[in-house]
């Protein structure tokens, strides 16, 4: 169950999709990727307050136990719910190939 | 790619499966669950240092960008990679039913 999308901490503070610009050097890819030279990396960043975008029953349990035992049980964490595919032009032993990666860019986010 | 399982922070400090004992009251389930009275909740807890149990390419990117921009990009987070099903005896309008939940107990963990 995907729970409430209202962020009690204020606009933009809770778990959501962010875009971070990164070069091949930033990503440590310069030695094996030729293109793109820069990637608009979409990732999930933000707090997961009680029941905000809870991914499933496990996330709801985590919220309850974090409230009881904050030093033992961490709050749920903002992670990708799904991904957008992306292609990379990458070096091979013999030249280059165009490779699709399905797990590289976050498409949307939830708390787990 | 599931990366290294060696924890550089010391035994038990990195992302792994933990068991937390919780009552129905702890979980906020007392009004709709009859049994079990207590649950051994398995959850994923621990740090996600560089490339430790990286779930996918996205986790590897997150590690790289966290190193570069620690105030903007959080480290990967320890979350369930899969779940174990669990049955609950729950109250219904007419009595009780046995319900299976597939997303309640973490089975194993990774960093994402």
């Amino acid at each position: 169950a995907r729970n409430g999308d209202h962020c009690p901490l204020g606009p933009g503070r809770c778990c959501r999709l962010h875009t971070v610009r990164a070069s091949l050097e930033d990503l440590g890819w310069a030695d094996w990727v030729l293109s793109p030279r820069e990637v608009q990396v979409t990732m999930c960043i933000g707090a997961c307050p009680s029941q905000f975008r809870a991914a499933n029953m496990h996330a709801q349990i985590k919220t309850s136990l974090h409230r009881l035992k904050p030093d033992t049980v961490p709050a749920p964490c903002c992670v990708p719910a799904s991904y957008n595919p992306m292609v990379l032009i990458q070096k091979t032993d013999t030249g280059v190939s165009l490779q699709t990666y399905d797990d590289l860019l976050a498409k949307d986010c939830h708390c787990i | 790619a599931r990366n290294g399982d060696h924890c550089p922070l010391g035994p038990g400090r990195c992302c792994r499966l933990h068991t937390v004992r919780a009552s129905l009251e702890d979980l906020g389930w007392a009004d709709w669950v009859l049994s079990p009275r207590e649950v051994q909740v398995t959850m994923c807890i621990g740090a996600c240092p560089s490339q430790f149990r990286a779930a996918n390419m996205h986790a590897q990117i997150k590690t790289s960008l966290h190193r570069l921009k620690p105030d903007t990009v959080p480290a990967p987070c320890c979350v369930p990679a899969s779940y174990n099903p669990m049955v609950l005896i729950q109250k219904t309008d007419t009595g009780v039913s046995l319900q299976t939940y597939d997303d309640l107990l973490a089975k194993d963990c990774h960093c994402i």
């Epitope: 595919p85 992306m86 292609v87 990379l88 032009i89 280059v96 | -």
Partner: antibody, heavy 118, light 107 residues
Framework: QVTLQESGPGLVKPSETLSLTCSFS??????????VGWIRQPPGKGLEWLAH???????YFNTALKSRLTISKDTSKNQVSLKLSSVTAADTATYYC??????????WGQGTSVTVSS | DIVMTQSPSSLSTSVGDRVTITCKAS??????VAWYQQKPGKSPKFLIY???YRYTGVPDRFSGSGSGTDFTFTISSVQPEDFAVYYC?????????FGGGTKVEIK
């Protein structure tokens, strides 16, 4: 397996608008870094790049033809359309569409022949 | 627009010979030059990316080199199936532009 197939009218009258469709399979135009481009080749001549459209809907056009070209995509139907207005005999050519990954055009359709004549 | 000037426009050669085609850009394009092969009645086939990188599945007798404005495409030992027209293309900036083509014929 990646395939692209161009379709068009075959014959167009001068001053009319040429409409071409590229239907493709084996890849998605919602994939970051993917685009579809159009290239033409007049009979017995070389290749001329016309336009391309990217996954994020960014569009680029041949400078000389920009005012006459329109490109659009239907991601759900796996189709890209190209329109060329006010055609003349000089637009007679085989029109190709090609799959692009950034600046690579690695898969091409077999081409569709278009003649501009009254 | 960047003009790509290809030479020669045609050449005659025999099976087993070495063939070299040159392409000159009207301005610096770094290494952003691709090469294509086109056989009669067929669509172009992508061979070389970024001056020197062979694309997946392209035989190693095909190679490319160069940077800036001067580029070279070489077939080290021409095979019967290599008789075709070859085009260079700059992918440095849009509008992308092609050279005029080089027809490789049997002597």
């Amino acid at each position: 397996q990646v395939t692209l197939q161009e379709s068009g009218p075959g014959l167009v009258k001068p001053s009319e608008t040429l409409s071409l469709t590229c239907s493709f399979s084996g890849f998605s135009l919602s994939t970051y870094g993917i685009g579809v481009g159009w290239i033409r080749q007049p009979p017995g001549k070389g290749l001329e790049w016309l336009a391309h459209i990217w996954w994020n809907n960014n569009k680029y056009f041949n400078t000389a033809l920009k005012s006459r070209l329109t490109i659009s995509k239907d991601t759900s139907k796996n189709q890209v359309s190209l329109k060329l207005s006010s055609v003349t005999a000089a637009d007679t050519a085989t029109y190709y569409c090609a799959r692009m990954g950034y600046d690579i055009m690695d898969y091409w359709g077999q081409g569709t022949s278009v003649t501009v004549s009254s | 627009d960047i003009v790509m000037t290809q030479s020669p426009s045609s050449l005659s050669t025999s099976v087993g010979d070495r063939v070299t085609i040159t392409c000159k850009a009207s301005q610096d394009v770094n290494t952003a030059v691709a090469w294509y092969q086109q056989k009669p009645g067929k669509s172009p086939k992508f061979l070389i990316y970024s001056s020197s990188y062979r694309y997946t599945g392209v035989p190693d007798r095909f190679s490319g080199s160069g940077s800036g404005t001067d580029f070279t495409f070489t077939i080290s030992s021409v095979q019967p199936e290599d008789f075709a027209v070859y085009y260079c293309q700059q992918h440095y900036s849009t509008p992308w532009t092609f050279g005029g083509g080089t027809k490789v014929e049997i002597k």
